[in-house]
Amino acid sequence: MAVTACQGLGFVVSLIGIAGIIAATCMDQWSTQDLYNNPVTAVFNYQGLWRSCVRESSGFTECRGYFTLLGLPAMLQAVRALMIVGIVLGAIGLLVSIFALKCIRIGSMEDSAKANMTLTSGIMFIVSGLCAIAGVSVFANMLVTNFWMSTANMYTGMGGMVQTVQTRYTFGAALFVGWVAGGLTLIGGVMMCIACRGLAPEETNYKAVSYHASGHSVAYKPGGFKASTGFGSNTKNKKIYDGGARTEDEVQSYPSKHDYV
């Protein structure tokens, strides 16, 4: 029961995490205009991985896609790649983990196969989460570097008369969504790996037993003479604690994503 709960919870947490990674990747607010030095601006800039947007105080928002591939910074390309890899791995992990769920019966799938699938999905979730965290962290580092560089030459004057305020960017909402989502996916993956240990069939159902013969003492370890002793590995991989009964009392809830303009 605890294994089912751990596996189910790991799946749900990973599902939420991957939904978050997808949301973060699609969001436009990876970097937002820093208003500390210009709180009275009537034009607000923010940028995502795929396009940059400008919101006017009039309420109008104009977004422009990055239609060039070669002209984009290598770091941005790297972040895009990390996020996409994270999403792909996460999606495959979700697909695998659905079939691995203990509460779902698929034909005569053996528990060892389910255990392997659970471990595989768990590892995929962990790597997916790490990709997302790495991608967001690389972008955040890029922002911090650019922020202090633009702070160094904040104002470029023309004869001291005219001021040109350089636009600085700070962390956008997508970064926090990405960090949290990556963390959730990572936690979900760890939970799946823990569940896998409980699902995996044990090598033996009994501890080693010593048999004392009248003449000389010989210690027998089960597994050595399967045919004669009958204490060998359970070739059918049936678990004693399973009892053959599987309860399908777990309901999966899928989060829905809403975009607010």
Epitope: V40, T41, A42, S58, G59, V162, T164, T167
Partner: antibody
Framework: QVQLVQSGAEVKKPGASVKVSCKAS????????IQWVRQAPGQRLEWMGY????????KYNEKFKGRVTITRDTSASTAYMELSSLRSEDMAVYYC???????????WGQGTLVTVSS | DIVMTQSPDSLAVSLGERATINCKSS????????????LTWYQQKPGQPPKLLIY???TRESGVPDRFSGSGSGTDFTLTISSLQAEDVAVYYC?????????FGGGTKVEIK
């Protein structure tokens, strides 16, 4: 077509308050921000503030902060600008305007003359 | 606040001739996010509210004759009337739309010589 119709001229005593209305028609009132601008005789145009009829968000010119209040009645598609503690230098034509691309004001009310006289 | 300075204060031009009005801002009105200049030009005739001519420094409002054109970037802007008509006699204002409070220039009065 888009129309902004303002209330009639007002004569007020110093220290009093004036409330100018601006009724919008020909478009969805809550979709566009309403700005208030005034023009004193022989002076340049002066921005006073705005209201977003959709969420009641307001922004004021610091010069008028505390004296000006911009409100709206969505059911009547009307915006209001109230200026308190009137002084002689507040004598001006007050305009409401609808905001569009580039934060520009393509549609203006006909203007309301506010005279401050003791 | 951004200070908008217009020049000249008044301008007398013959019918059919070119009229040029300048506007200078104390801070750049160029937004790096979309590379647009948040400067607007208005025309005001006596007893009337201002009329929008140009926004984003060079985008003509619909219905505005093509003899009106705007140019410039950053802090220096120009409104040009390529061939002055009698109905163009008015006061022209530039406005900062980039930063609060929105500020207007002092105006340039255009007359016929």
């Amino acid at each position: 077509q888009v129309q902004l119709v303002q209330s009639g001229a007002e004569v007020k005593k110093p220290g009093a308050s004036v409330k100018v209305s601006c009724k919008a028609s020909g478009y969805t009132f809550t979709k566009y921000i309403i700005q208030w601008v005034r023009q004193a005789p022989g002076q340049r145009l002066e921005w006073m503030g705005y209201i977003n009829p959709y969420n009641d968000d307001t922004k004021y010119n610091e010069k008028f902060k505390g004296r000006v209040t911009i409100t709206r009645d969505t059911s009547a598609s009307t915006a209001y600008m109230e200026l308190s503690s009137l002084r002689s230098e507040d004598m001006a034509v007050y305009y409401c305007a609808r905001t569009y691309y580039g934060n520009s004001f393509p549609n203006w009310g006909q203007g309301t003359l506010v005279t401050v006289s003791s | 606040d951004i200070v908008m300075t217009q020049s000249p204060d008044s301008l007398a031009v013959s019918l059919g001739e070119r009229a040029t009005i300048n506007c200078k801002s104390s801070q750049s009105l160029l937004n790096s996010g979309n590379q647009k200049n948040y400067l607007t030009w208005y025309q005001q005739k006596p007893g009337q509210p201002p009329k929008l001519l140009i926004y984003w420094a060079s985008t003509r409002e619909s219905g505005v004759p093509d003899r009106f054109s705007g140019s410039g970037s950053g802090t220096d802007f120009t409104l040009t009337i390529s061939s002055l008509q009698a109905e163009d006699v008015a006061v022209y204002y530039c406005q900062n739309d980039y930063s609060f409070p929105f500020t207007f220039g002092g105006g340039t009065k255009v007359e016929i010589k």
